[in-house]
Interface confidence: low
């Protein structure tokens, strides 16, 4: 894996064990971008001390990429030409097409909390007047 493992705790196991899930996922929300352009999908897990062991990025039940605490990034072969890892645990989509419009999910596997999921809706516009959502920053 040619990318550095992000600086967070954890390993390759999923969370669980029946603990109270106190965390919340902050996302970029609804965003739009121009056809042919790029967009950063970003989520942030807060309000929990659980270890993040893996983050999956999915679109309509298809895995785009996974970032594993031990292994670093894995990009699904069918998306490797248009998906770039980062920044952080986010995902950059490139060479956008109108078909990229839809729901994207960040899925945080944590221990001991379990699984947290965040939703982002991306609209890819034909015109050059796409309004991007507010810039999202990881604290």
């Amino acid at each position: 894996y040619p990318y550095d493992v992000p600086d967070y705790a954890g390993g390759g196991g999923s969370g669980g064990g029946g603990s109270m899930m106190t965390g919340t996922i902050e996302t970029t929300g609804n965003i739009s971008a121009e056809k042919g352009g790029s967009i950063i999908l970003q989520c942030h897990l807060s309000s929990t001390t659980a270890q993040v062991t893996q983050v999956n990025w999915e679109q309509q039940d298809q895995l785009l990429a996974a970032c594993n605490a031990d292994l670093g990034w894995h990009i699904s072969p069918s998306f490797k030409d248009r998906v770039a890892p980062g920044p952080g645990l986010g995902l950059t989509l490139q060479s956008l097409t109108v078909n990229d419009t839809g729901e994207y999910f960040c899925i945080y596997h944590t221990y001991p909390d379990g699984t947290y999921t965040g939703r982002i809706f991306l609209e890819v516009l034909e015109s050059s007047v796409a309004e991007h959502g507010a810039r999202f920053q990881i604290p």
Partner: antibody, heavy 119, light 107 residues
Framework: EVQLVESGGGLVQPGGSLRLSCAAS????????MHWVRQAPGKGLEWVAF????????YYADTVKGRFTISRDNAKNSLYLQMNSLRAEDTAVYYC????????????WGQGTMVTVSS | DIQMTQSPSSLSASVGDRVTITCRAS??????LAWYQQKPGKAPKLLIY???TLQSGVPSRFSGSGSGTDFTLTISSLQPEDFATYYC?????????FGGGTKVEIK
Amino acid sequence: EVQLVESGGGLVQPGGSLRLSCAASGFTFSNFGMHWVRQAPGKGLEWVAFISSGSSSIYYADTVKGRFTISRDNAKNSLYLQMNSLRAEDTAVYYCARMRLDYYAMDYWGQGTMVTVSS
Amino acid sequence: DIQMTQSPSSLSASVGDRVTITCRASKSISKYLAWYQQKPGKAPKLLIYSGSTLQSGVPSRFSGSGSGTDFTLTISSLQPEDFATYYCQQHNEYPWTFGGGTKVEIK
């Protein structure tokens, strides 16, 4: 071709110890989390222990916690299960299994090694 | 821990039949369910993960559906090599837990 081969099983008395090994080949062992799963004779599957690829996360089933120790040697492409204070209810076929990278399912399994705890 | 309950525990079917096995989780596991096939004296084999994703090399007659607490494994047209025991497993959270198994026998 992915291959997982367990060894080290056998007959042991209650209270005794055994060390199981799992030799991996056909893939980059150091990239994958690994599980031990067992199956008592005529029964279903029971997850036993997990170790992440770099050994930074280790989890155990409550039934074996404090008695079993999972470890790995990535240089030797090997997974281990040290079993102490064995009980009759630990009698089972023990399988090592590889965890998928993208989801927490077990995509390749060894053929298993039989552990019998009996006096 | 999450309890996984499979039904039926056994069933008899003929070659060509459509077979459905269900698995229920004691609490929501989103879509994180795997299905395995095991033949006597052999290791389990992964068929489906993440609820509905077919593992590479598995015939398309196997399909999975469901989310939350209720899941189904369907074999659209049973073949002679499909007579085996099938297990579900939740891979949403630790400790990973399996259903009790469903034995598919020849009628």
